[in-house]
C-alpha cells in the first residue's frame, strides 16, 4: 500500500471546522 | 506544523475491499470534522463521507454512491480517521485525500479498482 | 443536490494583474444561523487542494490578503488582485451548507 503525506501551510494548528453547516440537511430536490 | 499522512491505497479488484487510514498530527484531532474526498479525472472532486467530532456524537454522512458500502471511523487517542470500502467499483477508482472538515488536508493515496 | 458552477473554465493572467473567477449555485447557500458556507479552494500543479477562503470572504490563516471573496445566496465570486507566479494551478468553490457537500468543476490559473 502507498502512504503518502501533505503538509499545510495554514499557521492555525486547530482545525476550522467553520466551512461547513453545523448541523447540515440534505439538499432540498428541484 | 500539522500534517495529516494518508495510507493503505492500491490496486483492488471490483468487489473487493480495502480499508484507508489517515493519521493527524499537529492539530487539535478531537475537536476536528474529519472528511474523506476523492479526485478523478471523470468526476474532478467529489465528497465522500464525514465524520464529527464528540461534541456532536461522532455523526457520519455520506455521499449516496457510498452509502451502505463505504464506513467512516475515528480514533481519537490515535489522531486517525479510517474509510473502510468494501464491494468496490471502477467508479470508486481515484486519489482519496482525508481533509479535516475541508481546512487541512493530506496529500492524498490513490485506489484503483480493476480487474 | 447543489451544482456548483464555475465560470471561465481557465485564464490566462500576467503576473501582476487581477484575476477573477465566479461561482453560481444552483441553491441558496444561505444556512439558517444566517451564515453562508461557500469556500475557495487552490490546488497547485502536483500537490492536494489547500483551504484559501471559508464562509464566502473570511481568508485562512497564512493566505495572501491579495485573495478575497465575495457574493451571496447563489453567486459567488474569488478575486487575486495581483497574480504571482505561486498562483497558478486549479482555484474550485465548494458548498458547505447542504449535503452532500458540492464542488465546482475547477478554473485553470494560467500564468502569461
Known amino acids: 500500500s502507498e502512504t503518502t503525506t501533505g503538509t499545510s501551510s495554514n499557521s492555525s494548528q486547530s482545525t476550522s471546522n467553520s466551512g461547513l453547516a453545523p448541523n447540515p440537511t440534505n439538499a432540498t430536490t428541484k | 506544523e500539522v500534517k495529516f499522512e494518508e495510507s493503505g491505497g492500491g490496486l483492488v479488484q471490483p468487489g473487493g475491499s480495502i480499508k484507508l487510514s489517515c493519521a493527524a498530527s499537529?492539530?487539535?484531532?478531537?475537536?476536528?470534522?474529519m472528511d474523506w474526498v476523492r479526485q478523478s479525472p471523470e468526476k474532478g472532486l467529489e465528497w465522500v463521507a464525514e465524520?464529527?467530532?464528540?461534541?456532536?456524537?461522532?455523526?457520519?454522512y455520506y455521499a449516496e454512491s457510498v452509502k451502505g458500502r463505504f464506513t467512516i471511523s475515528r480514533d481519537d487517542s490515535k489522531g486517525r480517521v479510517y474509510l473502510q470500502m468494501n464491494n468496490l467499483r471502477t467508479e470508486d477508482t481515484g486519489i482519496y485525500y482525508c481533509?479535516?472538515?475541508?481546512?487541512?488536508w493530506g496529500q492524498g493515496t490513490s485506489v484503483t479498482v480493476s480487474s | 443536490d447543489i451544482v456548483m458552477t464555475q465560470t471561465p473554465l481557465s485564464l490566462s493572467v500576467t503576473i501582476g494583474q487581477p484575476a477573477s473567477i465566479s461561482c453560481k449555485s444552483s441553491?441558496?447557500?444561505?444556512?439558517?444561523?444566517?451564515?453562508?458556507?461557500l469556500n475557495w479552494l487552490q490546488q497547485r500543479p502536483g500537490q492536494s487542494p489547500k483551504r484559501l477562503i471559508y464562509q464566502v470572504s473570511k481568508l485562512d490563516p497564512g493566505i495572501p490578503d491579495r485573495f478575497s471573496g465575495s457574493g451571496s445566496e447563489t453567486d459567488f465570486t474569488l478575486k487575486i488582485s495581483r497574480v504571482e507566479a505561486e498562483d497558478l494551478g486549479i482555484y474550485y468553490c465548494m458548498q458547505g451548507s447542504s449535503l452532500p457537500w458540492t464542488f465546482g468543476g475547477g478554473t485553470k490559473l494560467e500564468i502569461k
Open positions: 465524520i464529527r467530532d464528540k461534541t456532536k456524537n461522532y455523526v457520519t
Open positions: 499537529g492539530v487539535t484531532f478531537s475537536e476536528a470534522w
Open positions: 441553491q441558496s447557500l444561505l444556512y439558517s444561523n444566517g451564515k453562508t458556507y
Open positions: 481533509t479535516g472538515a475541508m481546512d487541512y
